[in-house]
């Protein structure tokens, strides 16, 4: 070796100076005898070298570096050889910082495994080996006096986790805690944690599960759900509260708590739920009353409502067969009473025979709005209820009477917009119960199945606002029937449109005969279309080679027209408009020229 | 010198209730985990239940889980342990222990007798 | 919990002797093994600790052995005031479950 490289610390503070001596042994005899020593930082030349001869022969070069800003290089100490450098020595340099107190520092017991897990964050990257140590020690009281000392707990590299092993553990006492930083450049010690382990235990939640339906236990009510839940075995001895979450799996509802409860329950009802709904709970717990941590959240249950029976109110209307008496047509529709009204599975359609306790008969069983069936001769009045798994609504009577209640008078219609038709009456006297509307495409499309109907409640009212199923440019028959306590009064019905349409063309103009002055003209009227309001005049009009125009207004009978005080030898453009209630339509322009005065009448 | 002395024991039918005292003295109470054991006539030791010095972890056997509950009054350095729905196996001498840093049961009372009969 | 199954249930000995009893635990539970000895109408006393630990004013005489599952306690030279009920207990986790007792028996 011909050189050797000394340095007055390896490692130091990132930033700080650094000296280092490089001597090159007088033996070296195949070097210059006053050789030039260089030094190199990594890849770079670093002047300020100051060399000298020993008295020993032997060359010495002294450099200090004002600031070592890597954290990490090698110092070469160097000469010229021919055309390159040949390195002599080199040292490994260290810069780096003293580590930073570790913060943070929180302990966990791990039941299941029964250690004791503590984590910390190390504070920033000093740049040199670091180690981390976690001390504790057994104590009394709160840890003023240390006691004996517990195992050192080393994380593996680069983990600022360490698990204390339950043979290490105090569970019966207070431990002191600690993390202790250390590296080239000093060492650091974080705050002291003073714990009993058991108040740190990480739980876990219990398992919810939903109860096994046993036969002499009720269904849970509707909106409720029944389910219980099993706490987690090692936990068992702490003293717990837990809170469960609920919410909806459908819409964006936000979970709702419901809590304290029991760390356990063999049999617990939620309530106060949307019936027929599909929910999502989860149960979590912490230690109650001393201070603790909470758990997670446990797995899902998933666990749907049961339903109510329907609460509805059934409107109801019967038609009988012309030609069957016997065959009736009943509708009907729910109204629900209340916001949540129950799901509505069908309908069942039902008679109870007189004299035969308990007997019922099912005449229809029914998803529509409607069923047809044949009353029995003796059959006065017919049940219809709403169902669904959790039962009925409340039987809706339908007595099937003659018509001996007085009638409503004025029956008219008229139009709101294309969608809606206003319908009006005199109420009769003594006020109705109340009315039943019927309305439906008229003639020639009429039909008794396709009618749409609704019940006003109010026997008092003097009119309805009819919006569905209402189209423009169609004539609609409007049936009104007045209902009293038993009976009902006959139906009156109307027609209207809600829109009618203009006339489509107006008729074609003919020349019949020419004058001079005058020119008489004649059409065909165009036959009435259904939807198509009838023609309330014709407005004839002319205009000559001068551009003036005149016009004449005609009853909607009217056939032709003579057209008096033209100029002869003229050019007329003449038209037609047909007009009705819902607008008007021009014909097609008839141009003519009327004679010469030297010329003869055409007729 | 360390003293336990226990009360409360007595004659009840089954379905009663009783409370049985356990008050400490001669060291610190409020920094050791306490306990009750019991002893049937004739028979072993049973652990009962424990405290922590705080009173927060309360480990029960599964033959009085849900009926007995054991408290502690640091303040006036007493444990408690109430029992419910006592039934005639209940019957035993109770006996209340201070526990050492590594669970040993290092002092014991003279016991209380609780029988349970109609 | 931690099931404690002491061995024999009883046994005769004479003054003079050595005796040993076992007790085994149903887990691993370190060395967290306490030994108790019960005298009729008496409270128990505790003897041994951690497994091997004397408890203070206990004779030499007494010793612990074992760790894991499997533990010993040795009487080297039976004295008539040791004729008693011996009771192991475990104090791993906090269910303190006792062994059913070994009664010693004068022969």
């Known amino acids: 070796e011909c050189g050797h490289i000394s340095v007055s610390a390896p490692i130091v503070h990132l930033g700080d100076p650094i000296t280092a001596s490089c001597i090159i042994k007088q033996n070296c005899s195949h070097l210059d005898p006053e050789p030039q020593i260089l030094w190199r930082l990594g890849a770079e030349l670093q002047p300020g070298g100051r060399q000298q001869r020993l008295s020993d022969g032997t060359q010495e070069s002294i450099i200090t570096l004002p600031h070592l800003n890597h954290t990490q290089a090698f110092l070469s100490c160097c000469l010229n050889w021919g055309n390159s450098l040949q390195i002599l020595d080199q040292v490994e340099l260290r810069a780096g910082y003293p580590p930073a107190i570790p913060h943070n520092l929180s302990c966990l017991m791990n039941l299941t495994t029964s250690s004791l897990i503590c984590q910390w964050e190390p504070g920033p990257e000093t740049h040199l080996p670091t180690s981390f140590t976690l001390k504790s020690f057994k104590s009394r009281g709160n840890c003023q006096t240390q006691g004996d000392s517990i195992l050192d707990c080393v994380p593996k590299d680069g983990q600022s986790h360490c698990c204390i092993p339950r043979k290490h553990l105090l569970l019966y006492q207070n431990m002191g805690i600690w993390v202790q930083a250390e590296n080239a450049l000093g060492t650091s010690m974080s705050p002291q944690l003073c714990l009993d382990p058991m108040d740190v235990v990480k739980l876990e939640p219990p398992m919810l599960r939903t109860m096994d339906p046993s036969p002499e236990a009720a269904p849970p009510q509707a909106g409720c759900l029944q389910l219980c839940w099993e706490p987690w075995q090692p936990g068992l001895h702490i003293n717990q509260k837990c809170e469960l979450r609920h919410k909806p799996q459908r819409g964006e509802a936000s979970w709702a708590l419901v809590g304290p409860l029991p760390l356990e329950a063999l049999q617990y009802e939620l309530c106060g739920l949307l019936p027929a709904t599909a929910y999502t709970l989860q149960i979590r717990c912490i230690r109650w009353p001393l201070p603790g941590h909470w758990s997670d959240w446990s797995p899902s249950l998933e666990l749907r409502t049961t339903e109510r029976a329907p609460t509805v109110r059934l409107d109801t209307w019967w038609r009988q067969r012309q030609l069957d008496p016997r065959t009736v047509q009943l509708f009907w529709k729910p109204v629900p009473l209340e916001e949540d009204s129950g799901r509505i599975q069908g309908y069942v359609v039902s008679w109870r025979p007189s004299g035969q306790a308990g007997a019922i008969l099912p005449l229809c069983n029914t998803t529509e709005l409607s069923c047809t069936f044949h009353l029995p001769s003796e059959a006065q009045e017919v049940a219809l209820v709403a169902y669904n798994s959790a039962g009925t609504s409340r039987p809706t009577p339908v007595v099937f009477s003659e018509s001996r209640g007085p009638a409503l008078t004025r029956l008219h219609a008229m139009a709101r917009d294309p969608h809606s038709l206003w319908v009006g009456w005199e109420p009769p006297n003594p006020w109705p119960q109340g009315y039943v509307i019927e309305w439906g495409l008229g003639p020639p499309s009429a039909s008794n199945s396709n009618k749409t109907w609704r019940m006003e409640q109010n026997g008092r009212a003097t009119g309805f606002l009819l919006k569905e199923n209402i189209r423009p440019f169609q004539l609609y028959e409007i049936i009104v029937t007045p209902l009293y306590q038993d009976t009902m009064g006959p139906s009156q019905h109307v027609y209207a449109y809600s829109q009618e349409m203009a006339p489509s063309h107006a008729p074609e103009l003919h020349l019949k005969h020419i004058g001079k002055t005058w020119a008489q003209l004649e059409w065909v009227p165009e036959p009435p279309e259904l939807g198509k309001s009838p023609l309330t005049h014709y407005t004839i009009f002319w205009t000559n080679a001068q551009n003036q125009s005149f016009s004449a207004i005609l009853n909607a009978s009217s056939r032709g027209f003579v057209l008096h005080g033209l100029e002869p030898a003229s050019l007329y453009h003449i038209h037609l408009m047909a007009a009705s209630q819902a607008g008007a339509t021009n014909s097609t322009v008839l141009t003519l020229m009327t004679l010469t005065p030297e010329g003869s009448e055409l007729h | 010198e360390v003293q336990l002395l226990e009360s409360g024991g007595g004659l009840v039918q089954p379905g009663g209730s009783l409370r049985l005292s356990c008050a400490a003295s001669g060291f610190t109470f409020s920094l050791y985990w306490m306990g009750w054991v019991r002893q049937a006539p004739g028979k072993g030791l049973e652990w009962v239940s424990s405290?922590?010095?705080?009173?927060?972890?309360?480990p029960y056997a599964d033959s009085v889980k849900g009926r007995f509950t054991i408290s502690r009054d640091n303040s006036k350095n007493t444990l408690y342990l109430q029992m419910n729905s006592l039934r005639a196996e209940d019957t035993a001498v109770y006996y209340c222990?201070?526990?050492?840093?590594?669970?040993?049961?290092?002092?014991w009372g003279q016991g209380t007798l609780v029988t349970v009969s109609s | 919990d931690i099931q404690m199954t002491q061995s024999p249930s009883s046994l005769s000995a004479s003054v003079g002797d050595r005796v040993t009893i076992t007790c085994r635990a149903s887990q691993g539970i370190s060395s967290y093994l306490n030994w108790y000895q019960q005298k009729p109408g008496k409270a128990p006393k505790l003897l041994i600790y951690?497994?091997?630990n004397l408890q203070n004013g206990v004779p030499s005489r007494f010793s612990g052995s074992g760790s894991g599952t499997d533990f010993t306690l040795t009487i080297s030279s039976l004295q008539p005031e040791d004729f008693a009920t011996y009771y192991c207990q475990q104090s791993w986790m906090y269910a303190h479950m006792f062994g059913g007792g070994t009664k010693v028996e004068i022969k």
């Open positions: 405290i922590s010095s705080s009173g927060g972890v309360t």
């Open positions: 222990a201070k526990l050492g840093e590594l669970g040993q049961m290092m002092y």
């Open positions: 951690y497994a091997s």
